[in-house]
Interface confidence: low
Amino acid sequence: KKVVLGKKGDTVELTCTASQKKSIQFHWKNSNQIKILGNQGSFLTKGPSKLNDRADSRRSLWDQGNFPLIIKNLKIEDSDTYICEVEDQKEEVQLLVFGLTANSDTHLLQGQSLTLTLESPPGSSPSVQCRSPRGKNIQGGKTLSVSQLELQDSGTWTCTVLQNQKKVEFKIDIVVLAFQKASSIVYKKEGEQVEFSFPLAFTVEKLTGSGELWWQAERASSSKSWITFDLKNKEVSVKRVTQDPKLQMGKKLPLHLTLPQALPQYAGSGNLTLALEAKTGKLHQEVNLVVMRATQLQKNLTCEVWGPTSPKLMLSLKLENKEAKVSKREKAVWVLNPEAGMWQCLLSDSGQVLLESNIKVLPTWSTPVQP
């Protein structure tokens, strides 16, 4: 007997062909001999089967001797042997309907697990193979599990169900909820406005939740909450903000924060958390702020940086268009009795300048000592 595989929710067309290329009487029945549909002349008649409102045929094909059974919105329980009776002969077709669903939501937080469950008719023994968007293959039986989802797992998962040498393909769109970057670093001169952006790596039409930015300043003994906010249908509303610093927050996505000015006391690391409605767990993004200050006090020219710098970063002081006077893998450098001119303080990583601050040193006129 012919085997046809179908997908839950889809439409299937079971074929039945007569030798005569004309419209003749036919009936489709299920294995319990309950009539599903047939014809009476040019009219379609339906029997008392549970398929009643979901069963149909193509009248336009009857004249060619084709009498298909179309079943819409397939259910697992539609799996059965269907019999087409035409011209004193019976054609049997075994229909097996499968369903593949994600255990929970198809929107999962980074690091969470994805479980795909196969619904199959009794007596079937299918095998399943799924291919992730990044090309990883997973095989299994009734359930397939993938732990520790990563951002690259977002996209269409293609799963193939194999039964009786026939296959049916499912496509499941999985969205991994995460920020685009796990961590970012902003380099600013003292006094400059600071922009922090937290773009999400996914788009959801109705995004609701709440978030908070905790900040650990390098100079502070403990971290503090700088801002708390709500997200309702992609609109951001600030719940509470510290007075110092007074952060501004954009009203729309991507989440955007503005620090009025960079100051050494603000340099440090922040952790933005976002809790999404109906999701367990939170999204996190780390953000770092490095602040540079160049000062001249009496005969001492100093350049300092605050914040989380890596040990391989180089801090230099140089007179414009000249070689560096001082270069150290430290957070402060200085020059005593600097020459007059435009001095540059540079923070660099493997020759790439990350931050630059200029300071003008004026000539010092020595006044004669009075006799």
């Epitope: 788009t203 309702k232 509303s237 719940k239 009203k251 729309k252």
Partner: antibody, heavy 118, light 111 residues
């Protein structure tokens, strides 16, 4: 300035369908949701549904779910609301609307009168 | 669904007097300190006009004679003082959750 301009009045027979358009200008069309609201003569306002023009994702009032289709064409900055299987009690003025900076509908189309009569 | 009821159904006020319209929601429309209730004015043959959003915020360009208050389930729109051209129907609307809903309206007439 923000403007929402709707298509003209329609007269339909019961059982027919109607498709009302709403052309937006004066802002980035994909940045804001377009809502549809109707008002029967001398009656109150009733929310039909909404569309996110950027993605085409639409949400509708369960009361209309099987009969309404809300779509948007980004190329022409136009939103559409199609209502099928019209009944005489669908006779109403249909409005499209957009939020301002707050949560209320600050911008409205001029309205389209749909009359369902045999 | 959240059902809104307005009272009174109609109201006649003299110019210079205060008009008060109330709106009661079937459930709270508050979310973390904000009340998702809006008020509109509608004149015959025109679309509604937003007056107040989030219970008490005056929409730009709306005269300060209009004010909104309330939280949870009980909200009030006040017009003080009323002027001749305030003759209209006033609607409350919740934007807390789908389906968004409007109140039945209060018809205000100037004596």
């Amino acid at each position: 300035q923000v403007q929402l301009v709707q298509s003209g009045a329609e007269v339909k027979k019961p059982g027919a369908s109607v498709k009302v358009s709403c052309k937006a200008s004066g802002y980035t069309f994909t940045d804001y949701v377009i809502h549809w609201v109707r008002q029967a003569t001398g009656q109150g306002l009733e929310w039909i549904g909404e569309i996110y023009p950027g993605s085409g994702s639409a949400y509708s009032n369960a009361k209309f779910k099987d009969r309404v289709t809300i779509t948007a064409d980004k190329s022409t900055n136009t939103a559409y609301m199609e209502l099928r299987s019209l009944r005489s009690d669908d006779t109403a003025v249909y409005f499209c609307a957009r939020r301002g900076n707050g949560t209320g509908f600050a911008y409205w189309g001029q309205g389209t009168l749909v009359t369902v009569s045999s | 669904d959240i059902v809104l009821t307005q009272s009174p159904a109609s109201l006649a006020v003299s110019p210079g007097q205060r008009a008060t319209i109330t709106c009661k929601a079937g459930q709270s429309v508050d979310y973390d300190g904000d009340s998702y209730m809006n008020w509109y004015q509608q004149k015959p043959g025109q679309p509604p006009k937003l007056l107040i959003y989030v219970a008490s915020n005056l929409e730009s360009g709306i005269p300060s004679r209009f004010s909104g208050s309330g939280s949870g389930t009980d909200f009030t729109l006040t017009i003080n003082p009323v002027e001749e051209n305030d003759t209209a129907t006033y609607y409350c609307q919740q934007s807390y959750k789908d389906p968004l809903a409007f109140g039945p309206g209060t018809k205000v007439e100037i004596k």
